[in-house]
């Protein structure tokens, strides 16, 4: 595999079961969906829904399939050649700097800002300053900070959820 492998990625100990398909390696490597035998003579298929390999490899085992966490939806299941694809549920997003969990999207923008981008599974709502158009990357505003127009008028669009 081209990616760095950590021990958490690995499938539980397994020996080649009789039902696992075998083929011969090509130039010492096995195709995606397989791992190599100890003696390097056979390619052993990964187990569908349990483990996978995405690249030509000479690894002794396939990588363990990811299980989607609560708060995530499964976009596509794990196959022998591709890991599970999980996505944050609606109203939540996953940041690059904290990929281990889905965080709730903000429900509105801070005072003096307008919403220019909706909540998506991979990004929070995007707010910019009304005047300058500068992006805001601050923390979730306090409820009273959420932008509303002057008293008695309807809330501006940036106070609605995305």
């Amino acid at each position: 595999e081209s990616a760095l492998i950590t021990q958490q990625d690995l499938a539980p100990q397994q020996r080649a079961a009789p039902q696992q398909k075998r083929s011969s390696p090509s130039e010492g490597l096995c195709p995606p969906g397989h791992h190599i035998s100890e003696d390097g003579r056979d390619c052993i298929s990964c187990k569908y829904g349990q483990d996978y390999s995405t690249h030509w490899n000479d690894l002794l085992f396939c990588l363990r399939c990811t299980r989607c966490d609560s708060g995530e939806v499964e976009l596509s299941p794990c196959t022998t050649t591709r890991n599970t694809v999980c996505q944050c549920e609606e109203g939540t997003f996953r940041e690059e700097d904290s990929p281990e969990m889905c965080r709730k999207c903000r429900t509105g923008c801070p005072r003096g800002m307008v919403k220019v981008g909706d909540c998506t599974p991979w990004s929070d709502i995007e707010c910019v300053h009304k005047e300058s158009g500068t992006k805001h990357s601050g923390e979730v505003p306090a409820v009273e900070e959420t932008v509303t127009s002057s008293p008695g008028t309807p809330a501006s669009p940036c106070s609605l959820s995305g």
């Epitope: 492998i5 021990q7 690995l10 499938a11 539980p12 100990q13 397994q14 020996r15 010492g28 791992h35 190599i36 035998s37 100890e38 003696d39 390097g40 003579r41 000479d58 690894l59 002794l60 085992f61």
Partner: nanobody
């Protein structure tokens, strides 16, 4: 974190025997190979022997076949190398290494290495 600690090296006369050990910790891979490599003074790393943890597949370099025996104790997570009929040319630092690749007799296939233990064969 994977750690490998070799022991058992020392000075021995030609024709004598030594048993090297390599205690491994932090290994939770479903299968892996453990090997002995050696480096003689002024020379490069040379593959000596390998054994796989799950199926027990074993490899030896031609230069040690019939004289050296590799074995493992799964319960202690320890690798051994029984060296008999030692010769002056067996003098080297012996390293224990771990791989997660099949048919691994090349150094580049090994991800984890011990610090080494010195074996000197001399009269």
């Amino acid at each position: 974190e994977v750690q490998l600690l070799e022991s058992g090296g020392g000075l021995v006369q030609p024709g004598g025997s030594l048993r090297l050990s390599c205690a491994a910790s932090g290994l939770t891979f479903p299968n892996y190979g453990m090997s002995w490599f050696r480096q003689a003074p002024g020379k490069g790393l040379e593959f000596v022997s390998a054994i796989y943890w799950s199926g027990g597949t074993v490899y030896y370099a031609d230069s040690v076949k019939g004289r050296f025996t590799i074995s493992r104790d799964n319960s202690k997570n320890t690798l051994y190398l029984q060296m008999n009929s030692l010769r002056a040319e067996d003098t080297a630092v012996y390293y224990c290494a771990v791989t997660i690749r099949g048919a691994a007799t090349q150094t580049w296939k090994y991800d984890y290495w011990g610090q080494g233990t010195l074996v000197t064969v001399s009269s």
